[in-house]
């Protein structure tokens, strides 16, 4: 642990004369530097050098060649790795006063007349005379205002707002400060701190948006931290909103976005005269360009009932904001001339869901259906087919004769979709056909009796069957069934014997 | 003795930029704060704003924020009052005053700013 | 912003006359109050600062008074060169504001 550097001279304060030089001299273990007014200029008649001594410790002088009340102020001798910027200079300090009859109060920045006051909490009114001996007031709308003085560091008291005046008579010459300002500022125990990104995604090029909202509370200090902090590429702005209650609004702008930009965007913010801490945080992602995900939740074949009402849905991931259509049979669908609807509903920010909805499913619905999305980058698109499913019914059930053969063949046709599957059935003993039990089922396999399905178009079936000879009167029953359901037809197929004697008879 | 010194005359087009100067001397120059005060034909005065030559910081009047610049070099004692975006109302004679109190105590001799198309 | 209203907006006078002008805030300004002599074509000049302090190389006829919002410049024995425009200026909160200025003339 190093000891305090040393200062020549050995005082806490000197009164230096008006336009002399003076030097001060600070004796250190390691590096030692100087703080001291005026310090952030490039100050011509403030000099600062290193000297070399035999005693093994590191000595600099400040030199000032003609002292003016700016030089006025607290001179501190510090090791430089000891400086950091939250914590106040630890060091050796010296107050120098520069007495100026024409210049009573040290000139100060234009920010050191905004005095901000917390709650009730005192403050100080940073007038500071160039001669400690010169006697101030301090004047309000009131009159003066009681308060102690300090030359070294102004009035401290507590003070309500408004415009504050110092005021000093030098040699019967009066002064007076630039109105100081004070301003009392709202601070809570605890941090409201929002954060927003009306948009977590982007594309190159684009600008990044985020803000961080502190309410009910204005002294505070908020840091951002995101991706491109580095290379300072963030804008930030404070805006201050006042009614109907306090709000610091801070704003991080990160313009012509690239892909390195995406990450963390963290906003922390510190109430500034407690410690309280309070931290918010969005992931941004930066694409290198546009893009459309297509997710959809049925398969690429799909049937419905008729008159059923039926939805499907797909899930879209697309950024920029995609445009979405639907086709029928590579036709864009006319919604109002049919029972079919479609809708697209933003999810989330990049997530949209549209729907396909049948009201009332018809035959003349079936087809291929696409969704397509589209938007400045890409273009997806996700084709199913639909078949509207009918149950089987039977259109028609008729017999053909083949003359003098004796053969005759049936011929039974039935629509449905699915395409209904036909069978055959026969009752030999007409008397007995109304009892389900005579009836028997045609086999492919039986000899002189031709079976055979025909499929006419998507979904009409004709279904035959022959008989090489027929010799007695039996009934054919045609049976046309699919998932949805089943119809029969009987027909009675006379020997043609029988219908010659009938024909004379 | 105290004297400030202003930059000459100057016509300038609405929408343009002026910069005036005020050359100091005959005082320390980073003592005491400068103010710019203008005054239109016939007219008043109106206070502009202020600039603290030691450290260089500065506060506006409301009405000229965002238009105007006041900056200092101490290397020569000049101050500069550079005002944006021009229109014929900122016609006016500009001033340069000394003051270690809000009170101005030396007035340099004024620079005519003439604003027309 | 503090107004400062002057009164009258000009006078004429004779030489030797006693002439007052006054000055009114919006608000209360203490004695932050500065008075300045304008000649035609001239930059202004102090001649009173903080309502009753007479700046170094005035005459003494001329006198500053009041405080609150109410003040006063006096001419105690007008002389010719004294025929000018005289304004006030509030020095007690930012931004300062001038009066709109009292021409005196000759009678």
């Known amino acids: 642990q190093l000891s305090l550097p040393s200062i020549l001279p050995n005082e806490n304060e000197k009164v230096v004369q008006l336009n002399s030089s003076f030097s001060l001299r600070c004796f250190g273990e390691s590096e030692v530097s100087w703080q001291y007014p005026m310090s952030e200029e490039e100050s011509s008649d403030v000099e600062i050098r290193n000297e070399e001594n035999n005693s093994g410790l590191f000595v600099t002088v400040l030199e000032v060649s003609s002292a003016s009340a700016a030089h006025t102020g607290l001179y501190t001798c510090y090791y430089n790795h000891t400086q950091t910027e939250e914590n106040e200079l630890e060091g050796r300090h010296i107050y120098i006063y520069v007495p100026d009859p024409d210049v009573a109060f040290v000139p100060l920045g234009m920010t050191d007349y905004l005095v901000i006051v917390e709650d009730d909490d005192s403050a100080i009114i940073p007038c500071r005379t160039t001669d400690p001996e010169t006697p101030v007031t301090l004047h309000n709308s009131e009159g003066v205002v009681p308060a102690s003085y300090d030359s070294r560091q102004g009035f401290n008291g507590t003070f309500t707002v408004g415009p504050y005046i110092c005021e000093a008579t030098v040699k019967g010459k009066k002064f007076q400060t630039i109105p100081f300002n004070v301003y009392a500022l709202k601070a809570t125990s605890e941090l409201d701190l929002e954060m927003e990104a009306l948009k977590t995604v982007y594309k190159s090029g684009e600008t990044i948006v985020v803000t961080c909202a502190v309410f009910n509370n204005e002294v505070v200090d908020l840091q951002w931290t995101y991706p491109g902090e580095v290379k300072g590429k963030g804008i930030t702005m404070l805006e201050e909103i006042k009614v109907p209650s306090i709000k610091l609004v801070y704003t991080l702008t990160v313009p012509e976005a690239t892909v390195k930009d995406s990450g963390d965007y963290e906003c922390a913010a510190r109430q500034a005269t407690r410690e309280v801490k309070e931290m918010k945080k969005v992931t941004i992602s930066v694409h290198e360009k546009g893009f459309i995900e297509i997710k959809p939740t049925f398969s690429q074949l799909e049937a419905v009932n008729l008159h059923e009402v039926k939805h499907f849905v797909v899930e879209v991931r697309a950024y920029p904001p995609p445009r979405i259509s639907w086709l029928k049979n590579n036709l864009t669908l006319i919604e109002n001339l049919t029972e079919i609807t479609t809708d697209v509903e933003k999810i989330q920010e990049i997530r949209y869901r549209s729907k396909l909805k049948l009201i009332r499913a018809k035959e003349e619905d079936s087809g291929h259906y696409t969704i397509v999305a589209q938007n400045e980058d890409a273009v997806k698109s996700y084709t199913f087919e639909l078949l509207t499913q009918v149950p089987s019914s039977i259109l028609d059930l008729v017999d053909d004769h083949h003359g003098s053969t004796g053969g005759q063949t049936v011929r039974c046709t039935a629509e449905g979709t699915p395409l209904p599957d036909i069978e055959w059935m026969i009752c030999k003993d007409i008397k007995k056909c109304n009892n389900e039990t005579s009836w028997t089922i045609l086999a492919n396999n039986v000899s002189n009796i031709i079976t055979e399905i025909h499929s006419r178009d998507r979904s009409t079936v004709e279904g035959r069957v022959t008989f090489a000879k027929v010799e007695e009167t039996i009934a054919v029953r045609c049976l046309a069934k699919n998932l949805l359901g089943a119809e029969n037809r009987e027909l009675k197929l006379v020997a043609p014997t029988l219908r010659s004697e009938l024909t004379v008879a | 003795q105290v004297q400030l010194v202003q930059s000459g005359a100057e016509v300038k087009k609405p929408g343009a930029s002026v910069k005036v100067s005020c050359k100091a001397s005959?005082?320390?120059?980073?003592?005491?704060?400068m103010y710019w005060v203008r005054q239109a034909p016939g007219q008043g005065l109106e206070w502009m704003g202020i600039i603290n030559p030691s450290g260089g910081s500065t506060s506006y009047a409301q009405k000229f924020q965002g238009r105007v610049t006041m900056t200092r070099d101490t290397s020569t004692s000049t101050v500069y009052m550079e005002l944006s975006s021009l229109r014929s109302e900122d016609t006016a004679v500009y001033y340069c005053?000394?003051?270690?109190?809000?009170?101005?105590?030396?007035w340099g001799q004024g620079t005519l700013v003439t604003v027309s198309s | 912003d503090i107004q400062m209203t002057q009164s009258p907006s000009s006078l004429s006078a004779s030489v030797g006359d006693r002439v007052t002008i006054t000055c009114r805030a919006s608000q209360i300004i203490s004695h932050f109050l500065n008075w300045y002599q304008q000649k035609p074509g001239k930059a202004p000049k102090l001649l009173v600062y903080?309502?009753?302090s007479l700046q170094s190389g005035v005459p003494s006829r001329f006198s500053g008074s009041g405080s609150g919002t109410d003040f006063t410049l006096t001419i105690s024995s007008l002389q010719p060169e004294d025929f000018a425009t005289y304004y006030c200026q509030q020095s007690f909160s930012i931004p300062l504001t001038f009066g709109g200025g009292t021409k005196v003339e000759i009678k």
């Open positions: 005959g005082y320390t120059f980073t003592s005491y704060y």
């Open positions: 903080v309502a009753s």
């Open positions: 005053a000394r003051g270690s109190s809000p009170f101005f105590d030396y």
